[in-house]
């Protein structure tokens, strides 16, 4: 008789999971040789333990904090970027911008980017075939923790001046419900940052409101003042020139406003 | 082979200063980490600092950061500790490391000896 | 006090297996590789085992280590009397941003 095996609506754990974040480990020591030492087969151990095991809508921060003690690698806190709805933009930019850091760009972020997993109550398997939705089955998945987990240690390590990348072409450019909104805008540190700043990202080429004037952006800047951050935000109106002009600041055509 | 030469060591009063050097040949110094490692007499191994390749990053053990400041100079194959502040508890054997991949100190120096002594 | 807690001594007769433990946390041992390192009077530190388990090449496979947790051993088999020798451990430090050595194992061959 086969167990009956609960059916999540989310897509299942990536296939070779366990594989895929072993191998990414190893490499991002390889890439940056300031993790030379870090032993990858213990990060998989202590990654494994906060899921396997364990009901899939139960796990809690608590459940990654062996893992979180790998944390403290050293990203300068004033060269923090964090982002919303616009990930890919943001990647190119810190590919560029070296000396600037997404959460992704951290070990624990670059580990998990764009993964799914999840395990089983009381079985040691992996559960390959449907992990819980977010909205549909329970917010206290292993991958909506995990993430909360680290982007809120991530905001709380930042300094001085931190941005942020939004998407202007989306209807809300600022999301309360993101990750930005929910979790990292509250554990920004104002005894430690002094301004967020915000670069809103025109979508389309002819587009050239002041998005910066958005009542979503009015909203997090209210957000932002209440907690004694300043705020301050700036329009890219064309991203294809904004990273160009990343890559050769020197061009002439970079003086004007991108 | 690999050498790590290590010079610079003596005799100094509390307070004053120091420069050890060490010259590397047998391998492509710059593309390696290198370290400083002391042994105080009757005592075990202690890491003093390292310095990283590339666009150097250093390292420091809490009993020596603020005083001592590890550099390197590629183009002479030459790795330095310049100590200030010396103390009495400083005397120790320095020996310079080559730093391996997985952050292993894979070769030494003999090391040189500095006695901080009034 | 080191970061790492290692036997202050150890002995076996020739030919016997010695192991060698060293404790340490999550900070250090827990997610970084371990490191094994010999050390004769008078002479420049041996690596001897790098990456918790690996020997470099000229070291022989006498010298075996292992990892576990926060914790690490190395073990000595077919002890020899030119093995007699003081051995640390070492593992990068994360609360630390450096390198910590264990206080050391003196191994006598009696």
């Known amino acids: 008789v086969p167990r009956w095996r609960q059916q999540w609506s989310g897509p299942g754990t990536t296939k070779r999971f366990p594989e895929t974040v072993l191998a990414r480990c190893v490499k991002y020591t390889e890439i940056h040789p300031e993790m030379r030492h870090v032993d990858c087969q213990s990060v998989w151990d202590a990654f494994k333990g906060a899921f396997i095991s364990k009901h899939p809508c139960n796990i809690t921060e608590e459940d990654y904090q062996p893992l979180m003690k790998l944390g403290t690698q050293t990203v300068p806190c004033n060269k923090i970027l964090l982002w919303s709805r616009i990930k890919d933009l943001a990647h190119q930019f810190t590919q560029v911008q070296r000396d600037m850091f997404t959460l992704e760009d951290t070990l624990l972020g670059y580990l998990a980017d764009d993964l799914t997993w999840c395990g089983e109550f009381n079985t040691s398997k992996i559960n390959y075939q449907s992990c819980p939705d977010w909205r549909k089955d329970c917010s206290n998945n292993p991958v909506s923790v995990f993430w909360k987990t680290v982007s809120r240690r991530f905001a709380e390590a930042a300094c001085d001046v931190v941005h942020v990348m939004l998407n202007g072409s989306r209807s809300k450019i600022f999301d309360k419900n993101s990750t930005f909104g929910s979790v990292e805008v509250h554990n920004l540190q104002p005894e430690k940052v002094q301004t967020l700043e915000a670069w809103v990202i025109h979508g389309g080429r002819e587009d050239s409101r002041d998005l910066c004037q958005d009542p979503t952006i009015k909203e997090l800047e209210s957000i932002i003042s209440k907690r004694n951050i300043q705020f301050s935000c700036k329009n890219i109106y064309r991203p294809d020139k904004f990273l160009q002009c990343v890559k050769n600041p020197e061009d002439s055509s970079c003086t004007s406003e991108i | 082979q690999v050498q790590l030469v290590e010079s610079g060591g003596g005799l100094v009063k509390p307070g004053g200063s120091l420069r050890l050097s060490c010259a590397a040949s047998?391998?492509?110094?710059?593309?390696?980490?290198m370290s400083w490692i002391r042994q105080a007499p009757g005592k075990g191994l202690e890491w003093v600092a390292s310095?990283?390749?590339?666009?150097?990053?250093?390292y420091y053990a809490d009993s020596v950061r603020g005083r001592f400041t590890i550099s390197r100079d590629n183009a002479k194959n030459s790795l330095y500790l310049q100590m200030n502040s010396l103390r009495a508890e400083d005397t120790a054997v320095y020996y310079c490391?080559?730093?391996?991949?997985?952050?292993?100190?894979?070769?030494w120096g003999q090391g040189t000896l500095v006695t901080v002594s009034s | 006090q080191s970061a790492l807690t290692q036997p202050p001594s150890a002995s076996g007769t020739s030919g016997q297996r010695v192991t060698i433990s060293c404790s340490g946390s999550?900070?250090?041992?827990?997610?970084?590789?371990v490191y094994w390192y010999q050390h004769l009077p008078g002479t420049a530190p041996k690596l001897l085992i790098y990456?918790?388990?690996q020997r470099p090449s000229g070291v022989p496979d006498r010298f075996s280590g292992s990892k576990s947790g926060n914790s690490a051993s190395l073990a000595i088999s077919g002890l020899r009397s030119e093995d007699e020798a003081d051995y640390y451990c070492?593992?990068?430090?994360?609360?630390?941003?450096?390198?910590?050595f264990g206080s050391g194992t003196k191994v006598t061959v009696l």
């Open positions: 490391a080559r730093e391996g991949w997985s952050g292993e100190f894979t070769d």
């Open positions: 047998g391998f492509t110094f710059s593309d390696d980490y």
């Open positions: 310095v990283s390749n590339g666009r150097p990053t250093t």
């Open positions: 999550s900070s250090n041992i827990g997610f970084h590789f």
């Open positions: 990456k918790n388990n």
């Open positions: 070492a593992a990068w430090d994360d609360s630390l941003s450096g390198y910590v």
